[in-house]
């Protein structure tokens, strides 16, 4: 009898431990992706950034997928999404085509099932980068809490991609799951 | 028999309650540190800010340590780190040496074991603050998700520290643990 | 005996499942509120924004309340609060009253028990929006980790509300609970 009880108890403990571990670890996907500057498109209009690192330096990913320039959600949930985008120009890089710049970021969500793309967050500034200064810099930060479904994709669009700061501490985006959908 | 079973059950319940409480409370260190403006250094380039409040007003800390101007990690995990830095100048504060300012923040991680310092996040802007305006203001916000190990230290570096806004709602940084390292 | 043990075990499992579900779901209130531009006040001084969506598009709320333009906390805890505020002006909207603008956001906490209002976070920038440009844009992002008590209210104040960008991806604020108060 007593041996049987202990076995039952062990089963309770064991199954609970599994459940606790599983719910804790699996319920918390995350990603922090840093810019891959070897493949930044040119131009000044809105451009989708498709080259990001996911496994070097500060970049990392777990229970999410990075594919074709997009961060793919594998698990339904509410996520905190964020992006930090830095732009810079030094006079040694040559003259800007225009001193009046629109430096913007758009964090977009694409649903495969219903082929559509929507902007979740945007930020930025119009800037006057005069030739009187040898160096110009500007950073944008956006963040917000969103419901994401498995299969949905997050991507980043920016204006003036040629001005992006290629450092991993400068231009990055990410997500982490905060809670399940009820 | 029945009494013994109830004792076993109580033990299961008790140990689980302990485990649940422990994992919930201990697994979530956090800090929100606000600037201590009584001791702001001078300089223009990267200057480390070492004076922060951790226990007054909005400032608070739990399961992390603040020492020698650095936020010390006591528990391995993935943390969301953030900083908000405000710069301001009023004509009554005196005359700036230059109108062309580089207002920047760098959130750095130092590892004691391998004595090295790395920038996790940076943000800011170059600004033209002319004497023709009586007041100037600019804020930077950065945030990101990082793996931190026990013993690692987070610190804040800024340019132009003499221009920092000393309010607790203006200049602060913080961290909170989101999940364990698998 | 054995039947009784199984009943006890089921009770352990059941109560634990309830506890796990309850602590997980109830312990995580959140809100993401987007600007309701049909009712934006005018003026250039600090104005409280009272019209926000909570149940359309990206806007959502759970275990918190939105009432009288304020986000009301229903559950004690430590929350991450954030706001993203975009300002914009196009020459087709007419001339600005002044080219020198102070574009600011203040995230405030009001306690009903002790009738007082305090600013938790502020951000923004002074801007020179010259008539030489046809379009101007600027975004502010702030975020931080705060202890909130049931009944406390979070609200948003901005300067120059007539310049707010009315898009749901542009002007929003939110909160999500990270952990209990010990």
């Amino acid at each position: 009898g007593s041996q049987h009880i202990r076995a039952e108890k062990a089963m309770v403990d064991g199954s609970w431990l599994d459940l606790a571990k599983r719910s804790k670890l699996e319920a918390q996907p995350f990603a922090h992706l840093t810019i891959n500057a070897t493949d930044i498109p040119s131009g000044s209009h809105k451009v989708s950034l498709s080259s990001w690192y996911h496994d070097r330096g500060w970049a990392k990913i777990s229970n999410m997928t990075f594919s074709n320039g997009k961060l793919i959600v594998n698990q339904d949930g509410f996520y905190y999404l964020y992006a930090n985008i830095c732009f810079r120009h030094h006079e040694t890089s040559g003259d800007l085509a225009t001193e009046y710049l629109q430096l913007m970021v758009y964090v977009t969500k694409t649903s495969i099932k219903i082929p559509s793309s929507h902007t979740l967050m945007k930020g930025g500034s119009t800037k006057y980068w005069s030739g009187n200064s040898e160096f110009h810099f500007y950073s944008i930060n956006v963040g917000g809490f969103f419901k994401l479904r498995s299969g949905e994709e997050i991507s980043i669009e920016v204006s003036n991609p040629s001005l992006l700061d290629p450092d991993q501490d400068a231009t990055y985006f990410g997500a982490f799951k905060v809670r399940d959908i009820d | 028999g029945s009494q013994h079973i109830r004792a076993e059950k109580a033990m299961v319940d008790g140990s689980w309650l302990d485990l649940a409480k422990r994992s919930k409370l201990e697994a979530q260190p956090f800090a929100h540190l606000t600037i201590n403006a009584t001791d702001i250094p001078s300089g223009s380039h990267k200057v480390s800010l070492s004076s922060w409040y951790h226990d007054r007003g909005w400032a608070k800390i739990s399961n992390m340590t603040f020492s020698n101007g650095k936020l010390i990690v006591n528990q391995d995990g993935f943390y969301y780190l953030y900083a908000n830095i405000c710069f301001r100048h009023h004509e009554t504060s005196g005359d700036l040496a230059t109108e062309y300012l580089q207002l920047m923040v760098y959130v750095t991680k130092t590892s004691i074991k391998i004595p090295s310092s790395h920038t996790l996040m940076k943000g800011g802007s170059t600004k033209y603050w002319s004497g023709n305006s009586e007041f100037h203001f600019y804020s930077i916000n950065v945030g990101g998700f990082f793996k931190l190990r026990s013993g690692e230290e987070i610190s804040i570096e800024v340019s132009n520290p003499s221009l920092l806004d000393p309010d607790q709602d203006a200049t602060y940084f913080g961290a909170f643990k989101v999940r364990d390292i698998d | 005996g054995s039947q009784h043990i199984r009943a006890e075990k089921a009770m352990v499992d059941g109560s634990w499942l309830d506890l796990a579900k309850r602590s997980k779901l109830e312990a995580q209130p959140f809100a993401h509120l987007t600007i309701n531009a049909t009712d934006i006040p005018s003026g250039s001084h600090k104005v409280s924004l009272s019209s926000w969506y909570h149940d359309r598009g990206w806007a959502k709320i759970s275990n918190m309340t939105f009432s009288n333009g304020k986000l009301i906390v229903n559950q004690d805890g430590f929350y991450y609060l954030y706001a993203n505020i975009c300002f914009r002006h196009h020459e087709t909207s007419g001339d600005l009253a002044t080219e020198y603008l102070q574009l600011m956001v203040y995230v405030t906490k009001t306690s009903i028990k002790i009738p007082s209002s305090h600013t938790l976070m502020k951000g923004g920038s002074t801007k020179y929006w010259s008539g030489n440009s046809e379009f101007h844009f600027y975004s502010i992002n702030v975020g931080g980790f705060f202890k909130l008590r049931s009944g406390e209210e979070i609200s948003i104040e901005v300067s120059n509300p007539s310049l707010l960008d009315p898009d749901q991806d542009a002007t929003y604020f939110g909160a999500f609970k990270v952990r209990d108060i010990d």
Epitope: - | A97, E99, Y100, G131, N160, S162 | -
Partner: nanobody, 127 residues
Framework: EVQLVESGGGSVQPGGSLRLSCAAS????????MGWFRQAPGKEREFVSA????????YYVDSVKGRFTISRDNAESTVYLQMNSLKPEDTAVYYC????????????????????WGQGTQVTVSS
Amino acid sequence: EVQLVESGGGSVQPGGSLRLSCAASGGTFSRYAMGWFRQAPGKEREFVSAISVGGTYQYYVDSVKGRFTISRDNAESTVYLQMNSLKPEDTAVYYCAGDASPYGYLREYTATRFDYWGQGTQVTVSS
């Protein structure tokens, strides 16, 4: 290497005026904060006035406030010090100085903050 050359000094009666000039060459003058110092015989070098990179901020030591005006012409790479209502105690050698990496407030400046110096020009105020 930046060269600074002062001119415009001379002798004047109390209450008179002088305009000092400092011409810069060999550097990016439009990125320097500029200042004027003076040294009277047997005394320490004294900070007189300074001007910001863009010329929109100026600083004056109390003893010259309201009498001296500092200005600059970045196109001509020149900084000026207009001295009115001169007094005998203004007698000194006046030096022009440039700071290539300006920061903070002009009021906090000391001689050690300046990277480049001119040779000086003599100003004598006596009746």
